[in-house]
Interface confidence: low
C-alpha cells in the first residue's frame, strides 16, 4: 500500500529575505483527508529531517528552520501525500534552495521634496525572523543597486528610469509640478538574484517647493 497515492506534481521554494516558503501542487483527486508531509535536507548534513507530518495547506513556512540559509550551502525539500495509512513517493525540489533563490525586496521607500528635487530614502527589509546580526546590508554588503522608476500622474506611460548605487537618491523634476510616483527594485550587481518592485509611493510637487535663485 506504500505507493498507491500519486506524488505531488511539483515542489518549489518562493523566498524573500528571511521569508522562505515551500510550495507544492496538489495531487489529482485528493480527498478531504489528504495531507502532505514535508522534509528538509541541509547540504553538508545529507540526512532528511521531517518538518511536518500532516500539512493540509499547499505551502509551508520554512523560515524558522532555514535561518542559516545565508551562511550555508543551501537546502533541498521534499513533499509527499499522505492519506490515512497510504502515502505517495516523495517529490523533491529540482534545484538547490540557496541565497541565490531569494527574491530581493525593499522594506519601504520614503519621499520628500527639497527645492524641486524629490529626495528618496530606501528602507531595507527588517524581517522579524532575522537574527540580530543578519541584516540585509551585512549579508549583501557590497554592490547593492536599485532601479528607480518614476511615473508622472496623469500619464501612465511617462517614465524616467535610473539606477542608483545608494539607499539615498535624488530625482530632478525639471521644474514640473504634479504628482510623481516612484517604485524601486533592488539588485546586487555581483549576484543573479531577482528583485521585486516595491509598492508605488507618490508625492505631490507644487510651485511652493521651488526656490528662485539668481
Amino acid at each position: 500500500h506504500g505507493t498507491e497515492l500519486p506524488s505531488p506534481p511539483s515542489v518549489w521554494f518562493e523566498a524573500e529575505f528571511f521569508h522562505h516558503i515551500l510550495h507544492w501542487t496538489p495531487i489529482p483527486n485528493q480527498s478531504e483527508s489528504t495531507c502532505y508531509e514535508v522534509a528538509l535536507l541541509r547540504y553538508g548534513i545529507e540526512s532528511w529531517n521531517s518538518i511536518s507530518n500532516c500539512s493540509q495547506t499547499l505551502s509551508y513556512d520554512l523560515t524558522a528552520v532555514t535561518l542559516d540559509l545565508y551562511h550555508s550551502n543551501g537546502y533541498r525539500a521534499r513533499v509527499r501525500a499522505v492519506d490515512g495509512s497510504r502515502h505517495s513517493n516523495w517529490t523533491v525540489t529540482n534545484t538547490r534552495f540557496s541565497v541565490d533563490e531569494v527574491t530581493l525586496t525593499v522594506g519601504s521607500v520614503n519621499l520628500e521634496i527639497h527645492n524641486g528635487f524629490i529626495l528618496g530614502k530606501i528602507q531595507l527589509p527588517r524581517p522579524k525572523m532575522a537574527p540580530a546580526n543578519d541584516t540585509y546590508e551585512s549579508i549583501f554588503s557590497h554592490f547593492r543597486e536599485y532601479e528607480i522608476a518614476i511615473r508622472k500622474v496623469p500619464g501612465n506611460f511617462t517614465f524616467t528610469h535610473k539606477k542608483v548605487k545608494h539607499e539615498n537618491f535624488s530625482l530632478l523634476t525639471s521644474g514640473e509640478v504634479g504628482e510623481f510616483c516612484v517604485q524601486v527594485k533592488p539588485s546586487v550587481a555581483s549576484r543573479s538574484n531577482k528583485g521585486m518592485w516595491s509598492k508605488e509611493e507618490c508625492i505631490s510637487l507644487t510651485r511652493q517647493y521651488f526656490t528662485v535663485t539668481n
Epitope: 532601479e147 522608476a149 511615473r151 501612465n156 506611460f157 511617462t158 517614465f159 524616467t160 528610469h161 517604485q183 527594485k185 531577482k194 528583485g195 521585486m196 518592485w197 516595491s198 509598492k199 508605488e200
Partner: nanobody, 126 residues
Framework: QVQLQESGGGSVQAGGSLRLSCGAS????????MGWFRQVPGKEREGVAV???????SYADSVKGRFTISKDNGKNTLYLQMNSLKPEDTAMYYC????????????????????WGKGTQVTVSS
C-alpha cells in the same frame, strides 16, 4: 525558470514586412509586461513596443502605425508584426518580460525587465 526565445528575424528590402515571435515558458503569472526592444551596436537598447496583461499597448514614436504587438495567451507567444520596414529599423530585436505584482505600468521607455531573450537580427536594406 522563465525562458524567452525569439524567432522570425532575417533580411528584407525596405518597405517589406517581417513577423517576430517570442515563445515564453516557465511562468504562471497572470500579471505581466512584455515587449520588444532593439539595439544597434554602439547604441543603447531602446523600447519598440510593449503590451500589458490587460491588453493595453504602447509604441515608440518611430514605429507607430507600422508595427503591431500582440500576444496569444493560449500559446504563450508574443508577436511583433513589422510592416513598411526602413533601413533604420535594422537592429538586434529582443523579447523581454517583467512578471508579477507591483511592477510599474508598461511603457516603451521601461527597460526594467527581469527576463530577456537572446535576440533575433533584423536587417533592412535600401
Amino acid at each position: 525558470q522563465v525562458q524567452l526565445q525569439e524567432s522570425g528575424g532575417g533580411s528584407v528590402q525596405a518597405g517589406g514586412s517581417l513577423r517576430l515571435s517570442c515563445g515564453a515558458s516557465g511562468y504562471t503569472y497572470s500579471s505581466y509586461c512584455m515587449g520588444w526592444f532593439r539595439q544597434v551596436p554602439g547604441k543603447e537598447r531602446e523600447g519598440v513596443a510593449v503590451i500589458d496583461s490587460d491588453g493595453s499597448t504602447s509604441y515608440a514614436d518611430s514605429v507607430k502605425g507600422r508595427f503591431t504587438i500582440s500576444k496569444d495567451n493560449g500559446k504563450n507567444t508574443l508577436y511583433l508584426q513589422m510592416n513598411s520596414l526602413k533601413p533604420e529599423d535594422t537592429a538586434m530585436y529582443y523579447c523581454a518580460a517583467d512578471l508579477g505584482h507591483y511592477r510599474p505600468p508598461c511603457g516603451v521607455l521601461y527597460l526594467g525587465m527581469d527576463y530577456w531573450g537572446k535576440g533575433t537580427q533584423v536587417t533592412v536594406s535600401s
